[in-house]
């Protein structure tokens, strides 16, 4: 291919040549595919709003928890158990948290009057000891509450534990109270203020609209837009029991989903609230179930810093805001339509698949002979022939052979390796249908050419009886008119070919051979048809006429132009043409592959 290209190469357009098949079946299949695909494309376009440019939500959240709880605490004072009533308000049970979260305390364990000094550890498997050998000075166990002094001291009675430097008395290892001390937190309410923004669409809104009844409480069906939630209802929605979760604590997700259609003609932008338990409720005791943390209230007593340590159990509510805002965008629409156009090619792919399958050799040889109802599918072979043009790779070894006593053409695509071309079986190829329009272009003279001396004027049919083999004709010759090749030994086998497969009359004896191949008048006409002002000397003319005769024979016997290029002429025909249009001196070169 040339490296440079002219201006005319730029201004050109290529398109495919198509085959239109008039078929009720395939027409129905095509429209069925097109209707289904068109319906799906339109449905997806509308239902998923694929004509919109979508943008994720940007949001801010603010919460307010309301409610009062009465707590009945059991405390031990001077060895006597006492029940103490206290009231907890928002400031007592909520803690400032970062991000979109708020925390509600539901249970707690208190260790009062702690100060920094030496004291025995609380008895556990890891802190109990029988001698000082079980304690190590300076040792800090991750589970411990202080730094060991290396002494094993009496904790209570005959229990001895390692002494530590820590906040004393050490916090007891005990279970969270049951039921939870702030069980009534179930009735607390939380107001969630959520402002959202779609900067790309220049749109801002919030979940609390003007005119909202602020005494409402959220209900999934009766009041789904109310931003005030009762904590117990949140747990009921997820199928959990608030009282059970309140003992150890947990994490609850409040999901706010904004699916906003910002088109003027279908404007809709309201939140959908849903709830999800986020902590692992099946956690093993050893893996710290629930949700808890410790915090301390510090104070001074007699100038000694003391603290009350509180282990707080409660529920952390995480507010998860997500969603998208979409607005009509012509580019999105064009991109979507473009991406779906290829689906319309599925009909063609499917129909081509059917044609290719039903016209395969497998169907022809195994299915059609036995399955009568499959017979109508044979028409696919016709469609296939019209649709596809099969070409063989033009290898140097490619040759086509035509015997007058066989209806098909043989394709030989192998090296002969010393064997006569006559004896090589090759592959059977159907003979192309004759295009009689080509004949009509031949001169009228073809029909009234003067007879060649010594031959009768009427058309001769090939004689049925075999021609007696001449003494000179080679072993492979079946017509008795072939001559040995003059080519070197290595190339000779290529010319060892007769016009027949079985013994019989030679094709050169037919009237048509004489009129189509040997008629100087016809051949000169064909040469002038190609080059009107052709003027050649006798020898050159003979050469041109000889090669034109070869071409005429190949076109006549092989039909297809592609096959004619690789056609090998039988020896009898070759020598008959050479006799008519001889070379003044030198050898004949024989067949040369055109590529």
């Amino acid at each position: 291919m040339p490296a440079c290209c002219s201006c005319s190469d730029v201004f050109q357009y290529e398109t495919n040549k198509v085959t239109r098949i008039q078929s009720m079946n395939y027409g129905t299949i095509k429209w069925f595919f097109h209707v289904i695909i068109f319906s799906y494309v339109c449905f997806a376009l509308v239902s998923d709003k694929l004509y919109q440019r979508k943008e994720p939500v940007i949001s801010s959240v603010h919460t307010k928890v309301k409610g009062i709880a009465e707590v009945k605490e059991e405390i031990v004072e001077n060895g006597v158990k006492k029940l103490v009533h206290s009231v907890f308000d928002t400031a007592d049970y909520t803690f400032p948290l970062q991000g979109n979260s708020f925390f509600v305390m539901t249970n707690f364990l208190k260790t009062e009057g702690q100060e920094q000094r030496l004291c025995p550890e609380y008895p556990t498997r890891r802190t109990l000891c029988s001698s000082d050998r079980g304690c190590k000075k300076g040792w800090m166990d991750p589970q411990s509450k202080g730094i060991q002094t290396g002494r094993c001291v009496v904790y209570e009675g005959n229990q001895k534990t390692c002494e530590v430097s820590a906040w004393c008395p050490i916090e007891a290892v005990e279970e969270a109270p049951r039921p939870a001390l702030l069980n009534s937190a179930e009735n607390f309410t939380v107001l969630i203020k959520n402002n959202i923004d779609f900067p790309g669409h220049n749109y801002t809104t919030r979940n609390i609209l003007p005119g909202l009844n602020i005494t409402c409480t959220f209900h999934k069906t009766q009041n789904p837009q109310c931003p005030i939630f009762r904590l117990g209802d949140i747990f009921r929605e997820t199928g959990d029991n608030f009282s059970d979760v309140a003992i150890q604590g947990g994490i609850m997700g409040i999901e706010i989903y904004w699916d906003c259609n910002l088109d003027r003609w279908f404007h809709h932008c309201r939140p959908k609230y849903s709830f999800r338990r986020l902590d692992d409720k099946t956690t093993n005791v050893s893996l710290y179930p629930g949700y808890n943390f410790r915090y301390a209230k510090y104070y001074k007593e007699n100038n000694v810093e003391k603290r009350t340590l509180i282990k707080v159990f409660g529920i952390r509510f995480d507010i998860l805001v997500f969603g998208t805002g979409g607005k009509f965008d012509i580019i999105q629409l064009v991109v979507y339509i473009g991406s779906t156009l290829s689906y319309f090619g599925l009909a063609a792919v499917f129909i081509d698949f059917l044609i290719d399958t039903y016209s395969s050799n497998c169907c022809r040889s195994h299915i059609y002979p036995w399955c009568k109802c499959c017979q109508p599918c044979v028409v696919n072979e016709y469609y296939y022939r019209k649709k596809c043009e099969s070409i063989v790779e033009p290898k140097p070894t490619l040759k086509y052979v035509s015997f007058v006593d066989e209806s098909h053409i043989r394709m030989v695509n192998q090296q002969l390796l010393g064997r006569s071309l006559q004896d090589v079986k090759g592959q059977e190829v159907p003979r192309p249908a004759m295009d009689f329009t080509d004949l009509s272009r031949l001169p009228l003279a073809l029909h009234d050419t003067p007879p060649i001396p010594g031959q009768p004027e009427e058309i001769q049919l090939l004689r049925k009886e075999a021609t007696p083999r001449s003494r000179d004709s080679p072993v492979w010759c079946q017509c008795g008119s072939c001559l040995p090749s003059q080519l070197p030994e290595s190339h000779r086998c290529l010319e060892e070919l007769c016009c027949r497969k079985k013994p019989g009359a030679c094709i050169t004896t037919s009237e048509l051979f004489r009129k189509l191949v040997l008629s100087r008048h016809v051949l000169q006409f064909l040469l002038l048809y190609q080059e009107p002002l052709l003027a050649l000397d006798v020898d050159s003319t003979n050469s041109r006429l000889r090669h034109c005769a070869y071409r005429c024979y190949a076109t006549w016997r092989f039909g297809s132009q592609d096959m004619a290029d690789f056609a090998i002429l039988p020896s009898c025909c070759r020598w008959r043409i050479r006799k008519e249009f001889p070379k003044s001196e030198g050898q004949y070169s024989g067949f040369k592959s055109p590529y």
Epitope: R125, R126, L128, C129, S130, R133, G134, C135, K136, W139, D141, P142, Q143, S286
Partner: nanobody, 129 residues
Framework: DVQLVESGGGLVQAGGSLRLSCAAS????????MGWFRQAPGKEREFVAA???????DYGDSVKGRFTISRDDAKNTVPLQMNSLKPEDTAVYYC???????????????????????WGQGTLVTVSS
């Protein structure tokens, strides 16, 4: 949970040897520190030897140099090889296991009976003079 079964106890002459074995059931055996304790009639339970899940060992003062503890995690066994036995070694020997899944038992606490959650039924060792 882990079940422990001791074997190999019996009567032996002073100066002789004996090999006790503790077989443990449970797939997580390799996460346990294993110990041998003994209790002579009318006395406190006394530490003999222990081996942590990562192979460090500790011995009671009275058995150092004579007893050897090891572990075979493939067979879930903890053998105790007792050599140069003395009449004062006569006692019921108990095998014990301490879970180290959530934190290893510090070496200096391998001798503490409080660290061990699971105990075997014991095997009697009698050393005659």
């Amino acid at each position: 949970d882990v079940q422990l079964v001791e074997s190999g106890g019996g009567l032996v002459q002073a100066g002789g040897s004996l090999r006790l074995s503790c077989a443990a059931s449970g797939r997580t055996f390799r996460h346990y520190a294993m110990g041998w304790f003994r209790q002579a009639p009318g006395k406190e339970r006394e530490f003999v030897a222990a081996i942590s899940s990562y192979g460090s060992t500790d011995y009671g003062d009275s058995v150092k140099g004579r007893f050897t503890i090891s572990r075979d995690d493939a067979k879930n066994t903890v053998p105790l090889q007792m050599n140069s036995l003395k009449p004062e070694d006569t006692a019921v020997y108990y095998c014990a296991a301490a879970d180290e899944t959530l934190g290893a038992v510090p070496n200096f606490r391998l001798h503490e009976k409080y660290e061990y959650e699971y105990w075997g039924q014991g095997t009697l060792v009698t050393v005659s003079s």
